[in-house]
């Protein structure tokens, strides 16, 4: 079988300054040099691109300076950590990894990872 | 919304070469993958081409590797098929069509006949 | 290369009633690769269901598509008027993308 699997965990809590973690990992049937690593959410069968990065094999995952994304790949590891979440932005974050380059091009999308984020409450009014 | 409007179309002499435009509105061009889809008369559906995301990886089918480029301008949100040393079974409606995030192709042109013909 | 095969070639049927369209592949396909679209006469294809079971944005829930490995299928639940077409099968896990033959769906 040829089709690459992805691999993310089913539940994420996002910290109370709003910042989630999770690991994607892929099977690659081939020998890819170049990847290229998508984060998506869905909501509501809406599908919209939350953050994207492409790097070479052995080279840092870099995302554009105003991602809330960043993230370090080790092998067939990806680390990703998505900043500045709110409640509202709960929801169902697919991992999606295409093996770019050399052909033949692979595509490979993760079951989701349902990040929760509670927003903290606001600190009480202190006399000191 | 999202559209895809093709162009370019006609008819050509063998050997001869024919550019396709697609143009796109209504998504950012740079976040999908963009495809050329072609259809012979009466046949079914063959896919042609793939450009990617900047634009540095392009992918063929073996019927037209060597022969057609894709490319894409994403100031003028525009898809192109150079096609060039055509033959007469390259006579079909070409289509372009946006990959949809999660696969699939979501969206497609009306798309343009190409006539390859003596 | 992934080769579909799709069965049967063209089926007769009558508004109401359910079709049952099957596609097979060469090698196995993840079920989250592959597609059915649907192409009436003088139109570009529309994309039904993504992901072997995904309905795309739009398509009425008659329309279901099930299966893994190399075994897909595409059921229409009760046959519209408007349901009578071509239907394309394809994957798209791995380049190059390749298409089904496609399978007629006719009125009886």
């Known amino acids: 079988c040829k089709a690459m699997h992805v691999a993310q965990p089913a539940v994420v809590l996002a910290s109370s300054r709003g910042i989630a973690s999770f690991v994607c990992e892929y099977a690659s049937p081939g020998k890819a040099t170049e990847v290229r690593v998508t984060v998506l959410r869905q909501a509501d069968s809406q599908v919209t691109e939350v953050c994207a990065a492409t790097y070479m094999m052995g080279n840092e995952l870099t995302f554009l300076d105003d991602s809330i994304c960043t993230g370090t790949s080790s092998g067939n590891q990806v680390n990703l950590t998505i900043q500045g979440l709110r409640a509202m932005d709960t929801g169902l974050y697919i991992c999606k990894v295409e093996l770019m380059y050399p052909p033949p091009y692979y595509l490979g999308i993760g079951n989701g990872t349902q990040i929760y984020v509670i927003d903290p409450e606001p600190c009480p009014d202190s006399d000191f | 919304q999202v559209q895809l409007v093709e162009s370019g179309g006609g008819v050509v002499q063998p050997g001869r070469s024919l550019r396709l435009s697609c143009t796109a509105s209504?998504?950012?061009?740079?976040?999908?993958?963009m495809d050329w889809v072609r259809q012979a008369p009466g046949k079914g559906l063959e896919w042609v081409a793939v450009?990617?995301?900047?634009?540095?990886?392009?992918y063929y089918a073996d019927s037209v590797k060597g022969r057609f480029t894709i490319s894409g301008d994403s100031s003028k949100n525009t898809l192109y098929l150079q096609m060039n040393s055509l033959r007469a079974e390259d006579t079909a409606v070409y289509y372009c069509?946006?990959?949809?995030?999660?696969?699939?192709?979501?969206?497609w042109g009306q798309g343009t006949l190409v006539t390859v013909s003596s | 290369e992934i080769v579909l095969t799709q069965s049967p070639g063209t089926l007769s049927l009558s508004p109401g009633e359910r079709a049952t369209l099957s596609c097979r592949a060469s090698?196995?396909?993840?079920?989250?690769?592959l597609a059915w679209y649907q192409q009436k006469p003088g139109q570009a294809p529309r994309l039904l269901i993504y992901g072997a079971s995904s309905r795309a944005t739009g398509i009425p829930d008659r329309f279901s598509g099930s299966g893994s490995g190399t075994d897909f299928t595409l059921t229409i639940s009760r046959l519209e008027p408007e349901d009578f077409a071509v239907y394309y099968c394809q994957q798209y896990g791995s380049s190059p993308f390749t298409f089904g033959p496609g399978t007629k769906v006719d009125i009886k």
């Open positions: 209504g998504f950012t061009f740079s976040s999908y993958g």
């Open positions: 090698q196995s396909v993840s079920s989250s690769y």
């Open positions: 069509a946006r990959g949809g995030l999660l696969g699939g192709f979501d969206y």
């Open positions: 450009i990617w995301y900047d634009g540095r990886n392009k």
